[in-house]
């Protein structure tokens, strides 16, 4: 189409454009102290602030420290970008115990099964490995994940984990388990980044640049900004997030630049009368009959999942909202009904951790 | 918490810049707003400016009459009005946000003291 | 620009009666509206934020209510020392913008 490659001719005139010849198109030209987010930006949103190497732009606009991981027990997962931190977690063979903003406090090693007992489910950066009895007949030697893979039901109990402290530790004082420290190391120098990408090519900002000042031709961002828990709506207005502040309401979304936050009813209810990025009116769930089936999962949580029966042999028990409006979400894959009994139960949603109290029935976990 | 210069006395075209010092707080943390006040009118916001990176924006009524600078190391903000006229001769003030606990938008719980700027021939 | 329009202009009460003063928004604003009390010779001071929430040290005979574009602030039982103008602003799109303001007199 001619508008896509317009002539270079139909940017002059125009301040706020310039020609790019590598793309035969009219760009826009960001102001001074932003800079584009693509070769040849089209609008204002496709400017932006510059950060100086090793930040990030935060939902708030502001240039802020991407976490480090220099920590010897830590290896970067994600790079820093421009608009998200670097992430950092637990270099191979130990698992988070204590996490932090995009990355790890404390990292411990994989526990090892003991003697008659055998991996169920490998260790990873986030959890420890989960062991479980041998099947009557399996050699109490066979204790590694090669050679022991037999599935096997019962309890599950887990070996201590050795605890690496970030501020004392280094990786020449980690005891050795089970033979695994050089392979551990070995593995950690293959997948620990040699020297982070995330400030190649990135522009420093020039402190002397005004960021309010028209800006000369390739310059960058120039979107408006808003102050914290504002966002840049369409016809490019700073207009206030909705607040998640009501008792029934929790964050789903975070307050971005360029969009609103955006609440959902609390677990155990359903948005009965719906409102623009929120709910103006919650319910909780009604309580309706159902059977329902145990999901397997992961034991080392401590906890018991419950799923919904398979489609189609869910009861129709949706609240009926005053005004008639359908709720948020009538998809029975939506929530989780818990029954260990088969009797009348309340649906929980899936965000809800649920766990089996003392007695054997299924509980909410407030969290 | 915050404090505004003294009253002004200037000329009909002339300019004057006022100043807003803070303290109590992380300078750097809020942005400054600015308030004008007819005598017997309401409040009129001027515009911000956000003190760790100088970025300002302004209500289209005072683009052309306001310029907002902010100096970090001695926690100051500025406004300075140009091509001054009778219909400057108000109190202009200097506020602040409150923390976005609950997020109510832009309350402002912290004024200075009002600076006063009369013109006249 | 949204709009905020404050009525009455001016209002005369005696110490022990109800006040309510209104605020209206030429467009919604959600509950992102505050009201601030001036007296004379003195710097606005904040009493609500969020259309209901009564600032830290404001006696609890100020209340604020509404949403959308209708607010009110009710002082349950004028006092002396509540003669001073009223202010309500909205924060919900830039500009902030307030509206006349009303004048208390007791």
């Known amino acids: 189409f001619p508008q896509d490659r317009p002539f270079e001719d139909t940017c002059h005139g125009n301040p706020s454009h310039y020609y790019d010849k590598a793309v035969r198109r009219c760009c826009y030209r960001c102001p001074m102290g932003l800079f584009p987010t693509q070769q040849c930006p089209q609008r204002p949103t496709d400017c932006r602030k510059q950060c100086e190497p090793d930040y990030y732009l935060d939902e708030a606009d502001r240039c802020t420290a991407c976490v480090t991981c220099s920590r010897d027990d830590l290896v970067e997962k994600t790079p820093c970008a421009w608009n998200s931190s670097r992430v950092c977690e637990c270099r191979p063979g130990m698992f988070c115990s204590t996490s932090a903003v995009n990355s790890c406090a404390r990292c411990f090693f994989h526990s090892v099964c003991p003697a008659g007992m055998i991996v169920k489910f490998p260790g990873t950066a986030q959890k420890n490995t989960v062991c479980e009895p041998a099947s009557p007949g399996v050699s109490p030697a066979c204790a590694s994940p090669e050679n022991c893979k037999e599935p096997s039901s019962g309890t599950i109990p887990q070996a201590k984990p050795t605890p690496v402290s970030p501020a004392t530790s280094s990786a020449s004082t980690m005891p050795v388990r089970g033979g695994t420290r050089l392979a551990q190391e070995a593995a950690s120098k293959l997948t620990r980044a040699p020297d982070s990408p995330s400030s190649v090519g990135r522009p420093s900002s020039d402190p002397g640049l005004s960021p309010t000042q028209p800006c000369p031709e390739g310059s960058g961002d120039c979107r408006k900004q808003c102050e914290p828990d504002y966002y840049l709506d369409e016809a490019g207005r700073c207009t206030a997030c909705v607040s998640c502040s009501r008792d029934d309401l929790v964050e789903k979304t975070p307050c971005a630049w360029n969009s609103s936050r955006t609440c959902e009813c609390r677990p155990g209810m359903i948005c009965a009368t719906s409102a623009t990025n929120s709910c103006a009116r919650c319910v909780p769930y009604p309580i309706c009959a159902a059977e329902t089936v145990t999901k397997p999962q992961d034991m080392a949580e401590k906890d018991t999942t419950f799923e919904a029966p398979p489609l189609g042999t869910q009861p129709d028990c949706n609240p009926t909202p005053e005004n008639g409006e359908a709720p948020a979400s009538t998809s029975p894959t939506q929530s989780l009904l818990v029954d260990s009994q088969a009797s009348k139960t309340l649906p929980i949603p899936t965000s809800a951790p649920v766990a089996l109290s003392s007695t054997g029935k299924p509980v909410l976990d407030a969290g | 918490l915050l404090h505004e210069s003294g009253a002004e006395v200037a000329k009909p075209g002339a300019s004057v810049k006022m100043s807003c010092k803070a303290s109590?707080?992380?300078?750097?943390?809020?942005?400054m707003h600015w308030i004008k006040q007819r005598p017997g009118q309401g409040l009129e916001w001027i515009g911000y400016?956000?003190?760790?990176?100088?970025?300002?924006d302004y209500n289209q009524n005072f683009k052309d009459k306001a310029t907002l600078t902010a100096d970090k190391s001695s926690r100051t903000a500025y406004m300075q009005l140009s091509s001054l006229t009778s219909e400057d001769s108000t109190v202009y003030y200097c506020?602040?946000?409150?923390?976005?606990?609950?997020?109510?938008?832009?309350?402002?719980?912290?004024w200075g003291q009002g600076t006063l700027v009369t013109v006249s021939a | 620009n949204i709009v905020m329009t404050q009525s009455p202009r001016s209002m005369s009460m005696s110490v022990g009666e109800r006040v309510t003063l209104s605020c209206k928004a030429s467009?919604?604003?959600?509950?992102?509206v505050s009201w601030y009390q001036q007296k004379p010779e003195q710097s606005p001071k904040l009493l609500i934020y969020?259309?209901?929430n009564r600032y830290t040290g404001v006696p609890d005979r100020f209340t604020g209510s509404g949403s959308a574009t209708d607010f009110t602030l009710t002082i349950s039982s004028v006092q002396a020392e509540d003669l001073a103008d009223y202010h309500c602003?909205?924060?919900?799109?830039?500009?902030?913008?307030f509206g006349g303001g009303t004048k208390l007199e007791i």
């Open positions: 506020t602040r946000r409150g923390p976005s606990y609950g997020n109510h938008g832009a309350w402002f719980p912290y």
């Open positions: 109590g707080y992380t300078f750097t943390t809020y942005w």
């Open positions: 400016i956000n003190p760790s990176t100088g970025y300002t």
């Open positions: 467009e919604n604003v959600d509950t992102y």
């Open positions: 969020g259309a209901s």
């Open positions: 602003g909205q924060s919900y799109r830039y500009p902030p913008t």
